[in-house]
C-alpha cells in the first residue's frame, strides 16, 4: 500500500506462494529448496494445490526466469495457531532445488537475536493489494518502511501489548504491507529480518503498525527444519 513497482528481478529471493494457480501470499527463498512464508497463509488451503513461483516480476506475463515449483512438504511452526499472530512462520520445501541465477537467489537471514534499531529503513515487497478498494497488482511492488520501537507498537492505541519479543513492527502511515503481502520479507540492510504476519489488520493506518515475525528469534527452528 502506498509503494511503487519494484525494479524487475532486483529481489531474486522473492516468492509468490500460490493456491490453485493464483497468488495467495508472499514468501522468501532462504535456501535452494526452501521458501519461508507465514503459517496462516495455508489455513484455508485445505485440498487446494499449493505451489511456489520463483523468478517472477509479473504474475501473468511470461518471463524467462519464472518457474513454478510444486511443494514437497509444508512445515508450519508447531506453535502457530489460527487465532494468534504468534509463531506465524511456514517453511515450504520445493519439489526440487531451485535453479539459481540472477533472478533466483536465496536471501541471507538474520541469526543474531537483537532488535533492529527503531527508525531503520527496511524494504517490504509483495503482490498484495495496493489500495483500499483491494486492487491486486500484476507486478511486484515494494515500499521502504521505518522500524517502530516495540513500546510504541504495544500502546493501547496501537497493538495493545500483543507485540512479543519475537515480533517487530514497522510504521504504517499510508505506506504499509497489506493483504496478500503476508509471508513476504522485511529486509533491512540486505538481510532478512522479518516475515509479514498474516493476521487480518487494517492497512495504512498510523495507529495500527505492520507486524512482522522476527526470523532471528526462530533460528533454531529454521535450522532444524532445513537440516
Amino acid at each position: 500500500l502506498g509503494g511503487r513497482e519494484a525494479e524487475a528481478h532486483a529481489r531474486p529471493y522473492m516468492a509468490s506462494v500460490q493456491l490453485n494457480g493464483a497468488h495467495l501470499c508472499g514468501g522468501v527463498l532462504v535456501a535452494e529448496q526452501w521458501v519461508l512464508s507465514a503459517a496462516h497463509c495455508l489455513e484455508d488451503a485445505a485440498d487446494g494445490k499449493v505451489q511456489v513461483l520463483l523468478g517472477a516480476h509479473s504474475l501473468s506475463q511470461p518471463e524467462p526466469s519464472k518457474r513454478l515449483y510444486d511443494v514437497l512438504r509444508a512445515v508450519p511452526h508447531p506453535d502457530s495457531q489460527p487465532d494468534t499472530i504468534d509463531h506465524d512462520l511456514l517453511l515450504l520445501q520445493l519439489s526440487e532445488k531451485a535453479t539459481l541465477g540472477p533472478a533466483v537467489r536465496p536471501l541471507p537471514w538474520q541469526r543474531v537475536d537483537r532488535d533492529v534499531a527503531p527508525g531503520t529503513l527496511c524494504d517490504v515487497a509483495g503482490w498484495g493489494i495496493v489500495n483500499h478498494a483491494g486492487r491486486r497488482p500484476d507486478s511486484l511492488q515494494h515500499v521502504l518502511l521505518p522500524v517502530l520501537d516495540r513500546a510504541t507498537c504495544n500502546r493501547r492505541t496501537h497493538h495493545d501489548g500483543a507485540i512479543t519479543e519475537r515480533l517487530m513492527c514497522a510504521e504504517s502511515n499510508r505506506r504499509d504491507s497489506c493483504k496478500g503481502d503476508s509471508g513476504g520479507p522485511l529486509v533491512c540492510g540486505g538481510v532478512l529480518e522479518g516475515v509479514v504476519t498474516s493476521g487480518s489488520r487494517v492497512c495504512g493506518n498510523r495507529k495500527k503498525p505492520g507486524i512482522y515475525t522476527r526470523v532471528a528469534s526462530y533460528a533454531a527452528w529454521i535450522d532444524s527444519v532445513l537440516a
Partner: antibody
C-alpha cells in the same frame, strides 16, 4: 508474574524535590511505555506523563511539564518520577502504570508536602 | 484537553441491582476508553479497555459500550465486592484524562 513495585512514602518540605521509583519485573521492561498518575487525598486520578523506556522519549501533561522529570534505568528495569518545587497541593499518592496489555499498576507512593 | 464528564458522581444501590455509569468526552475519542475500579487505599484495577473489551479475570457482569463521545459501564448484577469508585479514562489524546469518578455505595 508482572509486578510494579514502588518506593516507600516520603515527607518533603515545600520547595524541595522528590524522586519516586517504580521497579518492574515479570516482563521485558523496554517493550512498554510507563506512565505516571497521581491522586490527591479524596480526589480523582490525574495523569502526569509517560516515558518510552527504549528511547527515553516522554510526553507530559502541560501542568507538570516544568516540574516533572521522567527517567528510566533499563539495567534495573526501573522507572523514576522526579517532581521539583514541591508545594502542599502536591501531596498525593503517586502511581506508575504500564501502558499496553493488561492494566498493571504499582501499589502507589504517598508523598506528603508539609512545612 | 479532553474533558471526561462522568455521571452520576455517586449512587446508592443494593446487591443484585443493575448499575449504569456514563462518561461523556468533550470530543471524539473513538473507542480509546478504559474503565477502572478503585477501592480505598488500593491502586486502580482495570476493568474495560477499548470501550467494550474486558480485561482477563474481570467478571462478565461488567460490560462497557460506546464510541465517539458517549460511553457506558454497566454492572449487570451488583455484588458486595463491587462497592467502590469507578473511573473512565480516555487515551486517544494527550494529556490522558480521567472522569471525576463515580462512587457506588450500599443502599
Amino acid at each position: 508474574e508482572v509486578q510494579l513495585v514502588q518506593s516507600g512514602a516520603e515527607v518533603k518540605k515545600p520547595g524541595a524535590s522528590v524522586k519516586v521509583s517504580c521497579k518492574a519485573s515479570g516482563y521485558t521492561f523496554t517493550s512498554y511505555y510507563m506512565y505516571w498518575v497521581r491522586q490527591a487525598p479524596g480526589q480523582g486520578l490525574e495523569w502526569i506523563g509517560e516515558i518510552n523506556p527504549t528511547s527515553g522519549d516522554t510526553n507530559f501533561n502541560e501542568k507538570f511539564k516544568s516540574r516533572a522529570t521522567l527517567t528510566v534505568d533499563t539495567s534495573t528495569s526501573t522507572a523514576y518520577l522526579e517532581l521539583s518545587s514541591l508545594r502542599s497541593e502536591d501531596t498525593a499518592v503517586y502511581y506508575c502504570a504500564r501502558e499496553g496489555g493488561f492494566a498493571y499498576w504499582g501499589q502507589g507512593t504517598l508523598v506528603t508536602v508539609s512545612s | 484537553d479532553i474533558q471526561m464528564t462522568q455521571s452520576p458522581s455517586s449512587l446508592s444501590a443494593s446487591v443484585g441491582d443493575r448499575v449504569t455509569i456514563t462518561c461523556k468526552a468533550s470530543q471524539n475519542v473513538d473507542t480509546d476508553v478504559a474503565w477502572f475500579q478503585q477501592k480505598p487505599g488500593k491502586a486502580p484495577k482495570g476493568l474495560i479497555y477499548s470501550a467494550s473489551s474486558r480485561y482477563s479475570g474481570v467478571p462478565s457482569r461488567f460490560s462497557g459500550s460506546g464510541s465517539g463521545t458517549d460511553f457506558t459501564l454497566t454492572i449487570s448484577s451488583l455484588q458486595p465486592e463491587d462497592f467502590a469508585t469507578y473511573y473512565c479514562q480516555q487515551y486517544n489524546n494527550y494529556p490522558l484524562t480521567f472522569g471525576q469518578g463515580t462512587k457506588v455505595e450500599i443502599k
